[in-house]
């Protein structure tokens, strides 16, 4: 029959080429005499050559080695036709089937590989996959069917078989209990894959387990008691710093410390903080320190870790006994601030008040007085007593010393410790107003015509404060009310000046006395322009020249 | 009838080249890997060069790798043997051959004499 | 490379008589060889492929056998046409060897 079963060549042979594979022979060659041919890749179409067909004894050839890892199986058409090249037979599909030869060694996808676990972990405990790859057949032979082995650990501790690896799958897992990162961080596996299903070629990589760090240490305390001086009232002094080594990894949760104040800090006046790089505690002052109320304070600090401890530790505890060192405190005005109302103007040695400052400490100290800041020079102040008194005449009006009709002085206290501390305190005088300025007109130089001429309006303004300003009273004297008329409006706050006789051109002295609600009397001479004009003028104008 | 006529044999010196032809009739040259075989004078054959039938892949043994090309034009029917650097021992009478059957040698020519000689 | 090891080299038999040549191989090469006969001046020719093969027109005297490394032409009984020279060879492996020849001439 016109059939050939698939045709089986291993890879690599050796030759001589051309060589016979098969005989294609068609039953009809008894009548006619048959030319055979071959179609497909690896016939006429690429690649091309590899096989012929001897065109009158139907012989197919291979001409080269054939590998299976590049083309396994060519599917060729045979045909079959007369002298005449009428087909003779249909088509028959020709399979040549590359079988495998164990050309290829087994190679790993990396030259190491890189995994890690946990330290403690149960045996079991998967690790890491590694994988290695033959070109070769692993479904009809064992050719490139890996098996993989670990060839050897460094280091060999605690012993030399702490892992296994699945010799299908690669898979790396810990078959014994005791890896430690604190004694071996890092293993190196030289592992294996060898095709043939382990009893063929081999070939090696490296495998590096790194061992992952367990809070498995606790931090302890190296010293465990210490003794510290502060200075009182001292915020955020650094008391101590705490030592603590831990064996687990450097800069990792499991290392960094936290600390904790379990007891001594009933006031609530210490913190510790732990430093980023040393990992040391630094103990602080929250709060002043009194040396006065307590010099000793007695603290029980814990050192834990930011991760939880993976089994049962015991805690390491410090003890830090704080010496509180007396410092000479500086006096403090009570209160701080004192606001004192007091009139302006009083006589010169006139008390104004008492302002004294306490000692914090407990020795009787002598405290002196001084005036720190006193901008006019109105004051003085005893330095035994703290007395205030009256030097320089207090002026509510004064607006280069007095603001909001407060007049501010500081005072300083001084102890008699070595060394000396001072404290200072602020004294607000609220001066009272007292009717020491009469009412005054603005502006007071007027123009004015002397035909028609137009009212002249006086704003009327007082220093003092009400009741000692408006409403305003005013008079003329010296004969000014012969030719002018002065008079207040309604509500009190400006004078309007009239020219009531005619004046030749010319300047006069007006004066106008005004006084206040309280009767405080000023006298102001007004200068008034009177011009040869009508009505409104604002300047005289100049003589007329005719032409 | 199945004819093969080699040509291009001659006397050449050490160093020299060649080429040596086959015309091809009364078979179907193209389907034919072909062979080059070679006697020297009073002494048994020796293999020299075979090309595949498509001329895609070409054999040689080691005494004549690298020097001797063996090459066909199956438009032509004619088989080619390049010969470089010929030495005193090429010297031989050259015969081309086919294969037949799938195996070496089914059809000879009559050959034709190379001499190497200074 | 396989060794082709013939004998005898040279071999006097009579008309008729049965000739026996034989080829020996330095390995294994199946059933991959050929005889062939070459006359004095002329191109040689394929008498028996596959160790046992007969190609087509030649007589039925000569026969093949063997297989492996050991391999025999016999001539049944010698003919005037038959004094010629015999060469074997291998083509199961690369490359093609011949054997050194036997020549068979009148006794």
């Known amino acids: 029959d016109w059939v050939v079963a698939p045709i089986s060549v291993p890879e690599n042979g050796k030759g001589p080429f051309p060589q016979r594979l098969n005989q294609l022979k068609s039953n009809k060659d008894r009548d006619t005499k048959i030319f055979y041919s071959i179609t497909g890749p690896g016939a006429d179409s690429p690649p091309e050559g590899v096989f012929a067909v001897e065109k009158e004894t139907g012989w197919l050839l291979l001409n080269k080695p054939l590998d299976r890892e590049e083309i396994a199986k060519y599917e060729l058409f045979g045909h079959a036709v007369s002298e005449n090249g009428a087909s003779v037979e249909d088509p028959m599909n020709i399979s040549i089937i590359v079988t495998d030869q164990n050309d290829h060694k087994p190679k790993f996808t990396q030259d190491t590989f890189r995994g890690s676990v946990l330290e403690g972990v149960l045996p079991g405990t998967s690790v890491m996959q590694v994988t290695a790859t033959d070109e070769d057949d692993a479904i009809y032979t064992y050719n490139g069917v890996v098996a993989y082995s670990i060839h050897s650990q460094e280091p060999k501790d605690p012993h030399d078989l702490m892992f296994t690896i699945h010799r299908s799958t690669g898979t790396i897992s810990v078959i014994s209990s005791g890896l430690d990162r604190e004694k071996v961080p890092e293993y190196t596996l030289t592992i294996q894959a060898t095709d043939m299903d382990g009893d063929g070629s081999t070939t090696t990589a490296v495998a590096v387990v790194e061992i992952l760090d367990a809070n498995d240490n606790a931090p302890m305390f190296d010293p465990q008691k210490y003794e510290a001086h502060v200075p009182e009232n001292a915020v955020g002094h650094e008391v101590q710093r705490l030592t603590v080594t831990d064996l687990d990894a450097p800069n990792s949760p499991a290392w960094r410390a936290t600390y904790l104040i379990m007891g001594g800090d009933d006031g609530d006046h210490f913190t510790i903080t732990t430093h980023p790089e040393s990992n040391q505690g630094i103990l602080t002052t929250r709060k002043g320190l009194d040396f006065e109320a307590k010099n000793q304070h007695t603290l029980y600090v814990e050192v834990t870790n930011e991760a939880p401890f993976v089994l049962k530790l015991p805690t390491s505890t410090a003890t830090i006994v704080v010496h509180v060192e007396d410092v000479n405190e500086a006096p403090v005005f009570v209160p701080p601030s004192k606001v004192v109302e007091v009139q302006e103007g009083i006589p010169t040695g006139e008390p104004v008040c008492v302002y004294t400052a306490e000692d914090p400490d407990k020795e009787n100290q002598k405290i002196s007085y001084r005036i720190l800041r006193d901008p006019a020079g109105w004051l003085a102040m005893d330095p035994d007593s703290g007395q205030v008194t009256a030097v320089g005449t207090l002026d509510r009006e004064d607006e280069q010393f007095v603001r909001n009709n407060i007049y501010e002085v500081m005072v300083l206290a001084m102890d008699n410790g070595s060394p000396p501390t001072t404290g200072t305190g602020t004294l607000l005088l609220t001066l009272i107003d007292v009717n020491d300025h009469g009412p005054v007109p603005e502006p007071r130089q007027i123009t004015i015509c002397n035909q028609s001429p137009v009212r002249q309006v006086l704003n009327i303004t007082d220093k003092d404060l009400s009741p000692h300003t408006s409403p305003f009273q005013a008079q003329l004297t010296d004969d000014s009310d012969i030719y002018w008329t002065a008079e207040v409006n309604e509500e009190g706050d400006t004078v309007v000046l009239s020219l009531k006789k005619f004046l030749k051109q010319d300047t006069y002295d007006v004066h106008l006395s005004l006084s206040d609600h309280g009767n405080k009397e000023q006298l102001t001479v007004i200068r008034a322009t009177v011009c040869d004009c009508h009505g409104h003028v604002e300047t005289c104008p100049g003589p007329w020249k005719g032409g | 009838e199945v004819q093969l006529l080699e040509s291009g044999g001659g006397l050449v010196k050490p160093g020299g080249s060649l080429r040596l032809s086959c015309a091809a009739s009364?078979?179907?040259?193209?389907?034919?890997?072909m062979s080059w075989v070679r006697q020297a004078p009073g002494k048994g054959l020796e293999w020299v060069a075979t090309?595949?039938?498509?001329?895609?892949?070409?054999y040689y043994p080691d005494s004549v790798k690298g020097r001797f090309t063996i090459s066909r034009d199956n438009s032509k029917n004619t088989l080619y043997l390049q010969m470089n650097s010929l030495r005193a021992e090429d010297t031989a009478v050259y015969y081309c051959?086919?294969?037949?059957?799938?195996?070496?040698?089914?059809?000879w020519g009559q050959g034709t004499l190379v001499t190497v000689s200074s | 490379d396989i060794q082709m090891t013939q004998s005898p080299s040279t071999l006097s038999a009579s008309l008729g008589d049965r000739v026996t040549i034989t080829c020996r191989a330095s390995?294994?090469?199946?059933?991959?060889l050929i005889w062939l006969q070459q006359k004095p001046g002329k191109a040689p020719k394929r008498l028996i492929y596959?160790?046992?093969s007969l190609d087509s027109g030649v007589p039925s005297r000569f026969s093949g056998s063997g297989s492996g490394t050991e391999f025999t032409l016999t001539i049944s009984s010698l003919q005037p046409d038959d004094f010629a020279t015999y060469y074997c060879?291998?083509?199961?492996?690369?490359?093609?060897?011949f054997g050194g020849g036997t020549k068979v001439e009148i006794k």
């Open positions: 060879l291998q083509y199961g492996s690369s490359p093609l060897t």
């Open positions: 596959d160790t046992s």
């Open positions: 009364g078979f179907t040259f193209s389907s034919y890997a």
């Open positions: 390995q294994d090469i199946g059933i991959n």
């Open positions: 090309i595949s039938s498509g001329g895609h892949y070409t």
């Open positions: 051959a086919s294969y037949y059957y799938g195996i070496p040698f089914g059809y």
